[in-house]
Amino acid sequence: EDWQCPRTPYAASRDFDVKYVVPSFSAGGLVQAMVTYEGDRNESAVFVAIRNRLHVLGPDLKSVQSLATGPAGDPGCQTCAACGPGPHGPPGDTDTKVLVLDPALPALVSCGSSLQGRCFLHDLEPQGTAVHLAAPACLFSAHHNRPDDCPDCVASPLGTRVTVVEQGQASYFYVASSLDAAVAASFSPRSVSIRRLKADASGFAPGFVALSVLPKHLVSYSIEYVHSFHTGAFVYFLTVQPASVTDDPSALHTRLARLSATEPELGDYRELVLDCRFAPKRRRRGAPEGGQPYPVLRVAHSAPVGAQLATELSIAEGQEVLFGVFVTGKDGGPGVGPNSVVCAFPIDLLDTLIDEGVERCCESPVHPGLRRGLDFFQSPSFCPNPPGLEALSPNTSCRHFPLLVSSSFSRVDLFNGLLGPVQVTALYVTRLDNVTVAHMGTMDGRILQVELVRSLNYLLYVSNFSLGDSGQPVQRDVSRLGDHLLFASGDQVFQVPIQGPGCRHFLTCGRCLRAWHFMGCGWCGNMCGQQKECPGSWQQDHCPPKLTEFHPHSGPLRGSTRLTLCGSNFYLHPSGLVPEGTHQVTVGQSPCRPLPKDSSKLRPVPRKDFVEEFECELEPLGTQAVGPTNVSLTVTNMPPGKHFRVDGTSVLRGFSFMEPVLIAVQPLFGPRAGGTCLTLEGQSLSVGTSRAVLVNGTECLLARVSEGQLLCATPPGATVASVPLSLQVGGAQVPGSWTFQYRED
């Protein structure tokens, strides 16, 4: 018989139901926006906006200050009062649409859905390690703003993204707002604009540059601005919008818009379609050739990448990469593949593709039929002509007008579909050591911290835990404060360590000490933890072996048994070769001699499953008693592996030494030709790993083995005679004197 250890699924080495409690703050209402500030004097703050309220929190998430931002028309609205005596517009709740830091001052800028989407500026006043907001300044000059031209009307009730850029001594606000006909008719917000904050903080300078969805398209063509960021010489917006001005408006795709961060102009406004797909390793019949498209961006974040991912993406370590979580449609409903996929777009490649697209539009010879695009913003035209014109005039440049690059940038899911049913709603990417980690919030209120690698067929989790008991979706915007990330879910803000919330979800020592160095995990006798959790017994250098099972569960008191031990941390080396004298197995008082590994039995074990086997020959000592006992494996003096060395003892109960007893044999005669079915009856006949019935020294072929009975077919006899019959278990003879009589056939 060839018994094999059962495989242990990789998932059994971790428990994602372990409860972690991370610091949190109850904001008193649905969190609408959140931003963090870290000063250069060790002072820091978290700003959290809810309807009609702005909270200032310290780095410990304790409330430092609160401000009433609404309702507009309410005498208690502190921001409204900064605009002087009202009324300033229709009364109503203030939902915060923009919450950004102006790093130049530094100051916090908040813009809401009320008061024509105007903004308020709050100087930051660091006092000790805390930060307070000065009284708000109203960024609105009544005499400069009209319904048809309102430089101080920034936020759209449908959503606005803002990135602030310092240019010289001035702060420029790169603003992107979702519009519809009703919003556009009210104080004229723009789709994309660049606005300079006036030095006296009385609002934004008039005459700003802007692009807006043309009135005829406002009803059918809506653009959702998902994310904005500034890196290098550009500001980028990420949008979800209809793929075509003329076709079905529900057919959406994702675009990247690029604007110059060094010149407050929109002549070099460029758009590029981002294409993210799930391409399974084995393509199903009928599945699209390039993989299943996931056209709708849900969340995005850009970050420099660690060495390993950089190599996989064929870029240099530390280069900026845009990561996006994409779904199949607005509802993000389940398709054939996973609910969410993650694609990586190196910024350098995006810029190259855009620059090449511009050249393609503007260079000679002209590429016939190439459209400038962006027909929702500008009049249709063919390259190299400016919008709405038939030809270039001598004093205009093709390059000085907005352009949609004709080719899209395609990427495939980094996780190979392994996110499965998970619906990702928040994303923040960090580089820890040389590892790139995606910190993801989910629809059901969990945080997944996963290494970003593409070469594996399973996810490498730093952690996977529930933020609280509410199960509410984690919101899109994530902020970083020191070594923590701030996630919002419902009315709560949670502070999650970048290194993970802890180590208790790793259940085995091996999994614990194989965890990333940055997690600070160590073994505490019987659990995985960080040093502060168990300072006495915490160590990171060795793991005891772990016995999970053995076979067989019984063996003869006399004679040998080939014992197979199952578990983990036996070897640390795939070959399973054991240096002399490192492994000591005892069963009861008796030693079990290690057997060399049978190389023919070595089988590759996929990383998703793991099991280690160790075989030894058990020869009970004369002093060994019958009955139940323990199996003990002690490993010492093993050379260290990559992560730790094996050292220690594991004990498992459940082995029994038994004495086989033969009570009866029948029939006691049979033909000389052999083939008689012998039945041997007794007790403990099946113990151990080997048994033999010998008729005159020749083996009687065993047909059935059970605890109380053996069946075998007699071998042919040399002559008609009475011959000795014996039973050996584990190579030792079972007491008793039996004979079998060969008769004429």
């Epitope: 200050q65 609160s66 401000l67 009433a68 005498p75 208690g76 502190q78 009062a81 900064a82 002087g84 001052l105 100051a107 500026l121 709050h122 100087d123 930051l124 006043e125 660091p126 006092q127 307070h132 907001l133 000065a134 009284a135 708000p136 300044a137 903080a201």
Partner: antibody, heavy 117, light 108 residues
Framework: QVQLVESGGGLVQPGGSLRLSCAAS????????MSWVRQAPGKGLEWVSY????????YYADSVKGRFTISRDNSKNTLYLQMNSLRAEDTAVYYC??????????WGQGTLVTVSS | DIVLTQSPATLSLSPGERATLSCRAS???????LGWYQQKPGQAPRLLIY???NRATGVPARFSGSGSGTDFTLTISSLEPEDFATYYC?????????FGQGTKVEIK
């Protein structure tokens, strides 16, 4: 220790101008909002003006709006109050005070402004 | 503008007695952006309480502030000789910031 010292007060005719200064020391001036508060002889305290740490926000009492201008020079750790079109009812001791959210926690000793013909 | 009304205008008490000073706002003061100040003749005011109930640095424990919304109270649990002075409340919630007219605590 924190010190606020006002200067620039004196006698001025109605319609005239004065510029008050407040020299700050002993703390990080550019981290604090500052205010001017005045007290007419035998009367209570009257808040006059407020300026945030980086001058982004300035507030004024209705009684001085359009006539007084608050400013600060963080490089000189100094707060100013430019007073134009002075009236007899502006006669008071003018105090500069530090702080906003935690109240006005430090005050100068005041400088007297007398508007009289 | 938020008008702060302090009462009583004058409070005549003996040392060791408890003083209760009231400050009523014409409209709600959000998040308790309200302070109490003490002023003695010929001196600059001194901050006692901020945020309606937080004692400023160095202020003795006999001074306490309470209240929220529109009604605020300053309590001196046991008057010491040096506590006889004029007390002002101030809101710094809504522009323009305003002071109450003051309560004078005098020796009976």
């Amino acid at each position: 220790q924190v010190q606020l010292v006002e200067s620039g007060g004196g006698l001025v005719q109605p319609g005239g101008s004065l510029r008050l200064s407040c020299a700050a020391s002993g703390f990080t001036f550019n981290s604090y909002s500052m205010s001017w508060v005045r007290q007419a002889p035998g009367k209570g305290l009257e808040w006059v003006s407020y300026i945030s740490s980086r001058s982004s926000t300035t507030y004024y009492a209705d009684s001085v709006k359009g006539r007084f201008t608050i400013s600060r020079d963080n490089s000189k750790n100094t707060l100013y109050l430019q007073m134009n079109s002075l009236r007899a009812e502006d006669t008071a001791v003018y105090y500069c005070a530090r702080g906003y959210f935690h109240g006005m926690d430090y005050w100068g000793q005041g400088t007297l402004v007398t508007v009289s013909s | 503008d938020i008008v702060l009304t302090q009462s009583p205008a004058t409070l005549s008490l003996s040392p060791g007695e408890r003083a209760t000073l009231s400050c009523r706002a014409s409209q709600s003061v959000s998040f308790d952006y309200l302070g109490w100040y003490q002023q003695k003749p010929g001196q600059a005011p001194r901050l006692l309480i901020y945020g309606a109930s937080n004692r400023a640095t160095g202020v003795p424990a006999r001074f306490s502030g309470s209240g929220s919304g529109t009604d605020f109270t300053l309590t001196i649990s046991s008057l010491e000789p040096e506590d006889f002075a004029t007390y002002y409340c101030q809101q710094y919630n809504i522009n323009p910031f305003t002071f109450g007219q003051g309560t004078k605590v005098e020796i009976k």
